[in-house]
Interface confidence: medium
């Protein structure tokens, strides 16, 4: 995935802005081989957003997307 703060398949840094929840399509975790753990959100436009997996809003956004996948 390539997009905001994404380098190859690993995240170089975390996106600092608000997560655009209405624009999110899916998410995934980066590889364990990466030096930095990250959640990557993918928007409907295909943009990838690197996010801190320990951040509460990031965790809630993942839960939200999981709930939509079940619905």
């Amino acid at each position: 995935a390539r997009g905001t703060n994404v380098g190859r398949e690993c995240c170089l840094e975390y996106f600092k802005g608000a997560i655009p929840l209405r624009k999110l399509k899916t998410w995934y975790q980066t590889s364990e081989d990466c030096s930095r753990d990250a959640i990557v959100f993918v928007t409907v436009q295909g943009r990838a957003i690197c996010s801190d997996p320990n951040n509460k809003r990031v965790k809630n956004a993942v839960k939200y997307l999981q709930s939509l996948e079940r619905s």
Partner: antibody, heavy 121, light 113 residues
Framework: EVQLVQSGAEVKKPGESLKISCKGS????????IGWVRQMPGKGLEWMGI????????RYSPSFQGQVTISADKSISTAYLQWSSLKASDTAMYYC??????????????WGQGTLVTVSS | DIVMTQSPDSLAVSLGERATINCKSS????????????LAWYQQKPGQPPKLLIY???TRESGVPDRFSGSGSGTDFTLTISSLQAEDVAVYYC?????????FGQGTKVEIK
């Protein structure tokens, strides 16, 4: 004061095309999604779809996907609903409404006055 | 799609009495991000567009009289008019705002008995 002003009533024949409008004022038009709702005569509200005027990202109800097109022109703070070929069953009141400001999806906090579309041969 | 079902379809209540409208969703509308119930109520008077009364299941929109209240969570919700006034004659709709499409209930017509 937030206002959504819709275009006037239309009388059309089956097979004709139509584009109705909804002009927003009194707020930042590109900061809020705009939705369209159908109300057939004597019936309830049906959610058709929404658009983000900032980038024209559009989401449709499966019931209306391919039947109508929702668009927006942010330079004139106007959203549109259009048909390429009207049917008698498209006869209804159509409302535009503003989606509230929550992070996630939200209710419609302001509504236009409605545009009555009549399709009859 | 989430299906919203209201009951009853119509309701006749005496002036000053309590009116209760129920709304049931086919699946939970508890939003996992906000931890709020993504459920709104609207009032539509004859010849007028709908008006937002309540959002997040229980939060009254600014300017809405406090005789209107919303309650419930998960899949079961209620709109209560504590003391019906003549100007409350209208059709009331619930709407889930958790996931696209943001579906409405079929409406409940409230009249004066």
């Amino acid at each position: 004061e937030v206002q959504l002003v819709q275009s006037g009533a239309e009388v059309k024949k089956p097979g004709e095309s139509l584009k109705i409008s909804c002009k927003g004022s009194g707020y930042s038009f590109t900061s809020y999604w705009i939705g369209w709702v159908r109300q057939m005569p004597g019936k309830g509200l049906e959610w058709m779809g929404i658009i983000d005027p900032s980038d024209s990202d559009t989401r449709y109800s499966p019931s209306f996907q391919g039947q109508v097109t929702i668009s927006a022109d942010k330079s004139i703070s106007t959203a549109y609903l259009q048909w390429s070929s009207l049917k008698a069953s498209d006869t209804a009141m159509y409302y535009c409404a503003r989606v509230g400001p929550a992070d996630v999806w939200d209710s419609f906090d302001y509504w236009g006055q409605g545009t009555l579309v009549t399709v009859s041969s | 799609d989430i299906v919203m079902t209201q009951s009853p379809d119509s309701l006749a209540v005496s002036l000053g009495e309590r009116a209760t409208i129920n709304c049931k969703s086919s699946q939970s509308v508890l939003n996992s991000f906000t931890n709020n119930n993504a459920l709104a109520w609207y009032q539509q008077k004859p010849g007028q567009p709908p008006k937002l009364l309540i959002y997040e299941a229980s939060t009254r929109e600014s300017g809405v009289p406090d005789r209107f209240s919303g309650s419930g969570s998960g899949t079961d919700f209620t709109l209560t008019i504590s003391s019906l006034q003549a100007e409350d004659v209208a059709v009331y709709y619930c709407q889930q705002t958790n996931s696209i499409p943001l579906t409405f209930g079929q409406g409940t017509k409230v009249e004066i008995k």
